[in-house]
Interface confidence: low
């Protein structure tokens, strides 16, 4: 058993039939010694009397808000949550496995640049009685500070018969060093509480591995005289790290016909312009990637050929 | 060719060679995203590699003030990785394929370190840890880890030389 925050405790339980559970002694936070009674949640049934209450926590019915009273007055509360462990593995019932880039990926994180700012998100089908708290650090044994905001509901989607909720959080490394080579990973820890169930999810990564630039901006076409060729030009996204002579991008330019089956012409360049042949009804798209480290490509920025 | 007594390196040549190093490092181990090596216990493997850290002067401002600190750090790292790629971690079983980019990578590390090495002036290099894994699978895992950390190292080096070529070249 451990303290999640003031007066909120998590009981770690091995979850199997007839498991012995965990014995917990609750102590009423009061100088009073006599006339103290205990109740659970909204029930008025008295569970015991005295300054301490000993309970055997085995199932969710044993969890909840324990309250000690005297003469109709509430003296203190202790909220007990359960963290289930089945066959040696902690439960992951609250969040959905996103299965990308691999199985058991519950948290996904991305950064638009090397500033030490990143966003993580996760999915759940649960709509109510749900709270998240996020902590992060650089390294674990001698952690350096990362500040995370509050997790917020960022999207709702309908998937078949189910609604899916996406939550996200923004974090910023306190003393980021964009030009350095990371040697310790960022650790992100999400505490999830649904009703009386507690779960913990973690992710560990280097910023360089979660970089995904924004798409190039100001994508423009300039037809070349007496030719089917056009000069495509674009600019670095505003959110990318500066100076660009140091934090350089490479680009992929694609000409795509109306039909998805048509052959795509692709050209790769480190410059911010390229000359391509513009076919009728085709569109030209450009995306960006860190020039020196193969993290994710940006989404495409596109313009029609006509 | 060199950086005698604190003068500038051949920024453009270094830029070209360091960008080539990036390409080679990724072609030697492209499947980085498919294997989370941090789950495989890092204790005595790649902890000891030299990292380009915040105080090493490899940021744009630090390069403008005095690029020597950074170039020395990069040189140390190049020599370190060059020794690792020439060690039995890479030469032992399982043998690398004849067309493996590791050979080219090894040669390019040496080439870039020589471009940076001042004539008659030897920067201190870091000792390479004695890593001699007994099992072939351990060797394979160690290769992945070394290449993965090399990718991060050469990315920073390439940024340094690109910025130097663009802003510090005579």
């Amino acid at each position: 058993i451990w303290e999640l925050k003031k007066d909120v405790y998590v009981v770690e339980l091995d979850w199997y039939p007839d498991a012995p559970g965990e014995m917990v002694v609750l102590t009423c936070d009061t100088p009073e010694e006599d006339g103290i009674t205990w109740t659970l949640d909204q029930s008025s049934e008295v569970l015991g009397s005295g300054k301490t209450l000993t309970i055997q926590v085995k199932e969710f019915g044993d969890a909840g808000q324990y309250t000690c009273h005297k003469g109709g007055e509430v003296l203190s509360h202790s909220l007990l949550l359960l963290h289930k462990k089945e066959d040696g593995i902690w439960s992951t019932d609250i969040l959905k496995d996103q299965k990308e880039p691999k199985n058991k990926t519950f948290l996904r994180c991305e950064a638009k640049n090397y500033s030490g700012r990143f966003t993580c998100w996760w999915l759940t089908t649960i709509s109510t009685d749900l709270t998240f708290s996020v902590k992060s650090s650089r390294g674990s044994s001698d952690p350096q500070g990362v500040t995370c905001g509050a997790a917020t509901l960022s999207a709702e989607r309908v998937r078949g018969d189910n609604k899916e909720y996406e939550y996200s959080v923004e974090c910023q490394e306190d003393s980021a060093c964009p030009a350095a080579e990371e040697s310790l990973p960022i650790e992100v820890m999400v505490d999830a509480v649904h009703k009386l169930k507690y779960e913990n999810y973690t992710s560990s990564f280097f910023i360089r591995d979660i970089i995904k630039p924004d798409p190039p901006k100001n994508l423009q076409l300039k037809p070349l005289k007496n030719s089917r060729q056009v000069e495509v030009s674009w600019e670095y996204p505003d959110t990318w790290s500066t100076p660009h002579s140091y934090f350089s991008l490479t680009f992929c330019v694609q000409v795509q016909g109306k039909s998805k089956r048509e052959k795509k012409d692709r050209v790769f360049t480190d410059k911010t312009s390229a000359t391509v042949i513009c076919r009728k009804n085709a569109s030209i798209s450009v995306r960006a990637q860190d020039r020196y480290y193969s993290s994710s490509w940006s989404e495409w920025a596109s313009v029609p050929c006509s | 060719r060199a950086v005698p007594g604190g003068s500038s390196p051949a920024w453009t040549q270094c830029q070209q060679l360091s960008q080539k190093l990036c390409t080679l490092a990724w072609s030697a181990h492209p499947l980085v995203g498919h294997m989370d090596l941090r789950e495989e216990g890092d204790e005595e493997t790649t902890n000891d590699v030299p990292h380009i850290q915040c105080g090493d002067g490899c940021d744009p401002q630090g390069l403008r003030d005095n690029s020597q600190f950074c170039l020395q750090r990069i040189h140390q790292g190049l020599i370190f990785y060059e020794k690792l790629l020439g060690s039995d971690i890479f030469t032992g079983e399982p043998s690398l394929l004849p067309d493996s980019p590791v050979g080219q990578l090894h040669a390019s590390l040496l080439g870039l370190s020589q471009l940076l090495q001042p004539e008659g002036h030897h920067w201190e290099t870091q000792q390479i840890p004695s890593l001699s894994p007994s099992q072939p699978w351990q060797r394979l895992l160690l290769r992945f880890k070394i290449l993965r950390s090399l990718q991060a190292f050469v990315a920073v080096a390439a940024r340094v030389f690109a910025h130097g070529a663009a802003t510090l070249s005579p």
């Epitope: 303290e3 003031k6 609750l26 102590t27 203190s76 202790s78 650090s137 044994s141 001698d142 | -």
Partner: antibody
Framework: EVQLLESGGGLVQPGGSLRLSCAAS????????MQWVRQAPGKGLEWVSS????????LYADSVKGRFTISRDNSKNTLYLQMNSLRAEDTAVYYC?????????????????WGKGTTVTVSS | DIQMTQSPLSLPVTPGEPASISCRSS???????????LDWFLQKPGQSPQLLIY???NRASGVPDRFSGSGSGTDFTLKISRVEAEDVGVYYC?????????FGQGTKLEIK
Amino acid sequence: EVQLLESGGGLVQPGGSLRLSCAASGFTFSDYPMQWVRQAPGKGLEWVSSIWSSGGITLYADSVKGRFTISRDNSKNTLYLQMNSLRAEDTAVYYCARGTHGGGPPWYYYMDVWGKGTTVTVSS
Amino acid sequence: DIQMTQSPLSLPVTPGEPASISCRSSQSLLHTHGYNYLDWFLQKPGQSPQLLIYMGSNRASGVPDRFSGSGSGTDFTLKISRVEAEDVGVYYCMQARQTPYTFGQGTKLEIK
């Protein structure tokens, strides 16, 4: 300076009671879990009891469960151990120790500050 | 309960020489979050115990860097790279994975 000072030990007959105190100074007492650890003469260390920072949860070794009660008064920066039904095998030096968060999961605390101890002798 | 077994129980060492103490637990002390719940303490003669290492390998504040902790799961080691006269005393490992927290029997380090 961070300090813990135990008091209240002494000679007591089997079946008797004692109340140990541990006065804390030099840190924000109410932020830290606290524990009692004992050491019988010529023997090793034995964990006795822990109490979380707000005092709402207490944990005990089986050997003292039902006989000892750990409590704290955060306004007085003091930790207590009420020992009833004392037995000869409870004879030991009793140390109080502070639990400091280990920087990992929120429930990992290590005992980084110890008092000098107070001696409890149970004998007829 | 988790049993902790230390070896050797007595360790005579010459000053300047290295020393190594082993600690075994009857169950794994590695939490699924990747942390080992094992601490090392030193009790010098006539003094209260002092923390040396927490979480298996992290040196406590003010502990000289000649002390190091390693290991994971059920097998842990405390190493002293060069023993000094002031290192004499009894060394204990302790598991904090589950209550009751349990200590090893102690290893008495003495100077030859």
